[in-house]
């Protein structure tokens, strides 16, 4: 299969609510009409699905409906979101897009965006 | 060294099935997907199916959704392709690929299996 150049930003912090987004943008070679768009994390050297799509261009990704992530498309770019993220899942998050169709197949990995998430200090109890 | 082996292509006329199969072999196996792609003489190496095999979420491209099915027997470290109303435009030689994880890419290649829909 033939290779693609996917982009990422490095570091995304997450929200207060356990919300991070980022944007994948991968460099298409040619006029993709099919393409899957998969989130990978990695953290001590295990790998493990978090979510994955496929739209077609110019149309919504389709996530599973109990799907962490949600996203849009726009052009060669990708926008994702992922929700409901603790401290524990703080980790490198890998964007890898295939382009399915038409031929030829190419794929894409990106470097990962390291996502830090911080676990809300709960509220101080009232005297009131 | 991982090795990848096809069988099950031949000749058949349109409308009729074939059932190819990859086995794993020479290795420890928990890849992350295999799948099958197809190459046609002149023609670019093009996705035909792939199942990831944690989930076993299946994914098909359009030109075959509906008549082939990609199906694994873990105990066998083997993945099946049902291909079921075949036409002609299927003719290519059908080659098996295995992703050792989500971030590797498909690594290991078989070697192909020549199928051929003609009356």
């Known amino acids: 299969c033939k290779a693609m150049h996917v982009a990422q930003p490095a570091v995304v912090l997450a929200s207060s609510r356990g919300i991070a987004s980022f944007v994948c943008e991968y460099a298409s070679p040619g006029k993709a009409t099919e393409v899957r768009v998969t989130v990978l994390r990695q953290a001590d050297s295990q790998v493990t699905e978090v979510c994955a799509a496929t739209y077609m261009m110019g149309n919504e990704l389709t996530f599973l409906d109990d799907s962490i992530c949600t996203g849009t498309s726009s052009g060669n770019q990708v926008n994702l979101t992922i929700q409901g993220l603790r401290a524990m899942d703080t980790g490198l998050y890998i964007c890898k897009v295939e382009l399915m169709y038409p031929p030829p197949y190419y794929l894409g990995i990106g470097n990962g965006t390291q996502i830090y998430v911080i676990d809300p200090e709960p509220c101080p109890d009232s005297d009131f | 060294e991982v090795q990848l082996v096809e069988s099950g292509g031949g000749v058949v006329q349109p409308g009729g099935s074939l059932r190819l199969s990859c086995a794993a072999s020479g290795g420890t196996f928990s890849f992350y997907g295999m799948g099958w792609f197809r190459q046609a003489p002149g023609k670019e190496r093009e996705f035909v199916a792939d199942i990831r095999t944690s989930a076993g979420r299946t994914y098909y491209a359009d030109s075959v959704k509906g008549r082939f099915t990609i199906s694994r027997d873990k105990s066998k470290n083997t993945v099946y392709l049902q291909m079921n109303s075949l036409r002609p435009e299927d003719t290519a030689l059908y080659y098996c690929?295995?992703?050792?994880?989500?971030?590797?890419?498909?690594?290991?290649w078989g070697q192909g299996t020549l199928v051929t829909v003609s009356s």
């Open positions: 690929a295995a992703e050792p994880s989500g971030i590797s890419g498909w690594d290991y």
